[in-house]
């Protein structure tokens, strides 16, 4: 198992400081850490040195050392804080994509461990995080949403108090995908329709999906009908509706109607027969 020097789990330095991290193993060792500036890497057989003579808040993060040849796959880690009063947050990513049910890590890292007790998470625009969202804060990792739901998809900002002043990170866009994405669910109502010529009629084609990126159309035979689209969001689902309203039906309105909904995954179709009779 590799060993890191300095032999502490956490290291706190000021901006501009010189930082040297050394990893020693039995065989060759490798470093992994946040993508950040100014590091130089020097490897010499079984040891590897990461160093900077100008630490910045962007160097804040966990540096892990592994020994690729180690059958046990052991690793060692050290977390570096570069305590910069002008930069309370170091964002390791601005977009995070997970599948629902997974842990979602919003990687905003505090640059000063003393800030950990005053952190909070908000949705962009100053809105509170949804009440049902279960999350916690880890100084080494950021905010962690325990079991992400599709509904948690949003832009989040991390906040903390520095000397009585609020310090806010830039936004992190969280996208939570369905475990098994599927074509939209559709409904075509009524399932069949018979009208006397001159009567009113309504045919409603609706589709729902967890993702907003889908389309729904209503066709008579092979002809796509130009009908306004109504959109809504309820019970964690996006709903899109095209409703054909006829004040006085005629024989040319009769035929096979198809409701077609599609997204990147596929298409679903429902059909119904509309008959128009003389009397």
């Amino acid at each position: 198992i590799p060993v890191i020097e300095p032999s502490v789990p956490e290291l706190v330095v000021k901006p501009g400081a010189t930082v040297t991290l050394r990893c020693v193993g039995n065989g060759s060792v490798e470093w992994d850490g946040p993508p950040s500036p100014h590091w130089t890497l020097y490897s010499d057989g079984s040891s590897s040195i990461l160093s900077t003579n100008n630490a910045t808040f962007q160097n804040t993060g966990t540096y892990r050392c592994t020994e690729p040849g180690d059958p046990l796959g052991g690793s060692a880690a050290i977390h570096l804080y570069v305590k910069d009063p002008a930069h309370s947050w170091n964002l390791l990513a601005q977009e995070v994509t997970v599948v629902e049910g997974q842990e979602a890590v919003l990687p905003c890292l505090i640059t000063d461990p003393a800030l950990k007790d005053s952190v909070s998470l908000m949705r962009e625009g100053g809105r509170q995080v949804l009440r049902k969202t279960v999350y916690f804060f880890s100084p080494w990792r950021g905010f962690i949403i325990r079991k992400a739901k599709v509904l948690d998809s949003n832009t989040y900002v991390c906040k903390t108090m520095v000397n009585g002043r609020e310090s806010t990170s830039t936004g992190i866009w969280l996208k939570v995908n369905r475990v098994h994405p599927e074509p939209p669910q559709i409904k075509l109502e009524p399932s069949k329709l018979v009208r006397i010529r001159g009567e009113a009629a309504q045919i409603v084609c609706s589709a729902t999906n967890a993702e907003v990126g889908f389309n729904v159309i209503l066709k008579r035979g092979d002809t796509k009908l130009e009908i306004p689209l109504n959109s809504d969001f309820q019970d964690n689902y996006y709903k899109k509706v095209r409703a054909l309203s006829l004040n006085a039906v005629d024989f040319q309105d009769a035929g096979i109607y198809s409701c077609v909904a599609s997204n990147d995954v596929g298409t679903r179709t429902a059909t119904m027969n509309f008959q128009v009779v003389e009397s």
Epitope: E5, S7, P9, A17, T18
Partner: antibody, heavy 118, light 107 residues
Framework: EVKLEESGGGLVQPGGSMKLSCAAS????????MDWVRQSPEMGLEWVAE??????????FYAESVKGRFTISRDDSKSSVYLQMNSLRPEDTGIYYC?????????WGQGTTLTVSS | DIQMTQSPASLSVSVGETVTITCRAS??????LAWYQQKQGKSPQLLVH???NLADGVPSRFSGSGSGTQYSLKINSLQSEDFGSYYC?????????FGGGTKLEIK
């Protein structure tokens, strides 16, 4: 509030054994690196042993003077760290402190006294 | 093993004075040095980590400096509560050796 409380010290004859315990509270014990440090008028402060967290494979390290005689262990379910001391010598006499390592030895217990004497 | 040599071993000073304690490592410890204060009958307390960073709650009259093998702890305008013993310790690998200590006494 971080609290570390040592117990198990006392008088023991040379060649004897003793087990020290340290009960921790006020922090996530399973994530912590824990050490034992001892102090005597002759040797001053002397680092004895360290056990790291599960994330660091519970790696253990010892001072040369106690290697092969002392064993550090932990029970994360009880938030406790232990020091099993065998083949004790008079020079092992001193106050034994349990400490938590973060950026340094951030927190110390009040200490427990071990006397090795015939 | 890295040896830590601390000086002076003892110091007799008056309240309000400024004192400097030094610590020399037998090899480069890359600023991985901590300073501790210990009052009579009490456990040591962390004062400074990573050579220059004050631990939480430590008054600003304390300051740490140094790099490579040479380090120092400075206490400006000594207060009565500052009297006691001070120790340096390196964190560049194990064993984590301490300096021999400096006893600060009231003149």
């Amino acid at each position: 509030e971080v609290k570390l409380e040592e117990s198990g010290g006392g008088l023991v004859q040379p060649g004897g054994s003793m087990k020290l315990s340290c009960a921790a509270s006020g922090f996530t014990f399973s994530d912590a690196w824990m050490d034992w440090v001892r102090q005597s008028p002759e040797m001053g402060l002397e680092w004895v042993a360290e056990i790291r967290s599960k994330a660091n494979n519970h790696a253990t390290f010892y001072a040369e003077s106690v290697k092969g005689r002392f064993t550090i262990s932990r029970d994360d379910s009880k938030s406790s760290v232990y020091l099993q001391m065998n083949s004790l010598r008079p020079e092992d006499t001193g106050i034994y402190y349990c400490t938590r390592v973060k950026v340094g030895f951030d927190n110390w217990g009040q200490g427990t006294t071990l006397t090795v004497s015939s | 093993d890295i040896q830590m040599t601390q000086s002076p071993a003892s110091l007799s000073v008056s309240v309000g004075e400024t004192v400097t304690i030094t610590c020399r490592a037998s090899e480069n410890i890359y600023s991985n040095l901590a300073w501790y204060q210990q009052k009579q009958g009490k456990s040591p307390q962390l004062l400074v980590h990573a050579a220059t960073n004050l631990a939480d709650g430590v008054p600003s009259r304390f300051s740490g400096s140094g790099s490579g093998t040479q380090y120092s702890l400075k206490i400006n305008s000594l207060q009565s509560e500052d009297f006691g013993s001070y120790y340096c310790q390196h964190f560049w690998g194990t064993p984590r050796t301490f300096g021999g200590g400096t006893k600060l006494e009231i003149k």
